[in-house]
């Protein structure tokens, strides 16, 4: 059977929300003018064939705008970007499209999410607001990699 | 240029076993799907199974569980294919083949030369 | 488990199109088979030409095109070129696992 994608909504620690900003994902505090993108989350259907015990595999897009996060090198690092892509075309795949998935943790009420392409690199936002959601291997430091989920509907 | 160099051509007694080789260069092998699989004369393809080399998961076709094993170094870039029981049904060319994410889809777009396998006391 | 089928061979012409199909013994192909198309020239040499049912990879000439022609994939040479001839195969995907056909042998004369 085939799943659904569960719309939710991630802040981080610091109540700063998601919101799309020119194609790019940006992390800013919540106001009353502030409309956050609501995120799509579905998890890969091939999980037994990926690594256990590192989170749940989940392809995360953004809602109705056919957008999905992936993982890509830009020179030797690792970036983050949006890429036009329809995120069930991704869960139907025959194989676990990496670049797309990330591992999702779990640790009480935060949630971290870490690249399948690039072990070791999260999705994380700077200490400072309005800035771009990046990938970084500094966890705890200058950025924020602990988000809080919230399902929708 | 993207390359899957496959090892020689093998002469082995039935029973015995095998373990056949295919190295990759020109592309990160641990951002792909190796798989293998079966050429006999005047017969089709045959899907044997894949490596995911990144973390070593693997998938079989049924038919080959339990008769085949594929395994991945990828300290030299090289995926393995071992046969146990080996018998003349398994005398082929068996194929290293990539499969590969490129823009929206799987592709098999690049294939090792094969390895001819032939069994006979 | 499925039988994947394909026309055993095929002759065209130069400049003819031809259409050769894969067809599935457990019902109608769909784009959930994500079918692949891949050529073999003689001296085992294989390539990657299709996708996905169709997309075509990387550098693979725009006169070879894949579809779905009833409950069938099928792989289109829109002006076939003396080149193209070489046994073409088919790969259908069933939930966990790949099937080949045998293969078509397009001859072109």
């Known amino acids: 059977k085939s799943e659904m994608p569960q719309p939710v909504s991630i802040q981080d620690i610091n109540h700063r929300v998601w919101v799309l900003q020119d194609q790019i994902l940006i992390a800013v505090p919540r106001k009353d003018r502030v409309s956050p993108v609501t995120i799509s989350l579905i998890s890969c259907r091939h999980v037994e064939t990926l690594e256990k015990d590192r989170g749940n595999p989940i392809y995360l897009g953004l809602n109705g705008l056919n957008l999905c996060l992936m993982c890509a090198k830009a020179g030797d690092q690792p970036t983050l970007q949006l890429k036009e892509k329809d995120i069930m075309d991704l869960y139907n795949q025959p194989e676990p499209v990496k670049s797309f998935l990330f591992y999702h943790s779990q640790s009480g009420r935060n949630s971290t999410f870490e690249s399948v392409a690039f072990p070791g690199w999260f999705i994380a936002v700077s200490s400072e607001g309005g800035c771009p959601l990046i990938l970084t291997q500094e966890l705890g430091k200058a950025n924020t990699t602990d988000f809080g989920l919230t399902m929708l509907f | 240029e993207v390359q899957l160099q496959q090892s020689g051509a093998e002469l082995v007694k039935p029973g015995a076993s095998v373990r056949l080789s295919c190295t990759a260069s020109?592309?990160?092998?641990?951002?792909?799907?190796i798989h293998w699989v079966k050429q006999r004369p005047e017969q089709g393809l045959e899907w044997i199974g894949r490596?995911?080399?990144?973390?070593?998961?693997?998938r079989y076709d049924p038919k080959f569980q339990g008769k085949a094993t594929i395994t991945t170094d990828t300290s030299s870039d090289t995926v393995h294919l071992q046969f146990s029981s080996l018998t003349s049904e398994d005398t082929a060319v068996y194929y290293c083949?990539?499969?590969?994410?490129?823009?929206?889809?799987?592709?098999?777009?690049?294939w090792g030369q094969g390895t001819t396998l032939t069994v006979s006391s | 488990q499925a039988v994947v089928t394909q026309e055993s061979a095929l002759t065209t012409s130069p400049g003819e199109a031809v259409t050769l199909t894969c067809r599935s013994s457990?019902?109608?192909?769909?784009?959930?088979?994500?079918a692949n198309w891949v050529q073999e020239k003689p001296d085992h040499l294989f390539a990657g030409l299709i996708g996905?049912?169709?997309d075509r990879a990387p550098g693979v000439p725009a006169r070879f095109s894949g579809s779905l022609i009833g409950d069938k994939a099928a792989l289109t040479i829109t002006g076939a070129q003396t080149e193209d001839e070489a046994i073409y195969f088919c790969?259908?995907?069933?939930?966990?696992?790949?099937?080949f056909g045998g293969g078509t042998k397009l001859t072109v004369l």
């Open positions: 457990s019902g109608a192909v769909t784009t959930s088979n994500y």
């Open positions: 790969a259908l995907w069933f939930s966990n696992h790949w099937v």
């Open positions: 490596i995911d080399p990144a973390i070593g998961t693997t």
């Open positions: 083949a990539r499969l590969h994410y490129f823009g929206n889809n799987f592709f098999f777009d690049y």
């Open positions: 020109g592309f990160n092998i641990k951002d792909t799907y």
């Open positions: 996905g049912t169709n």
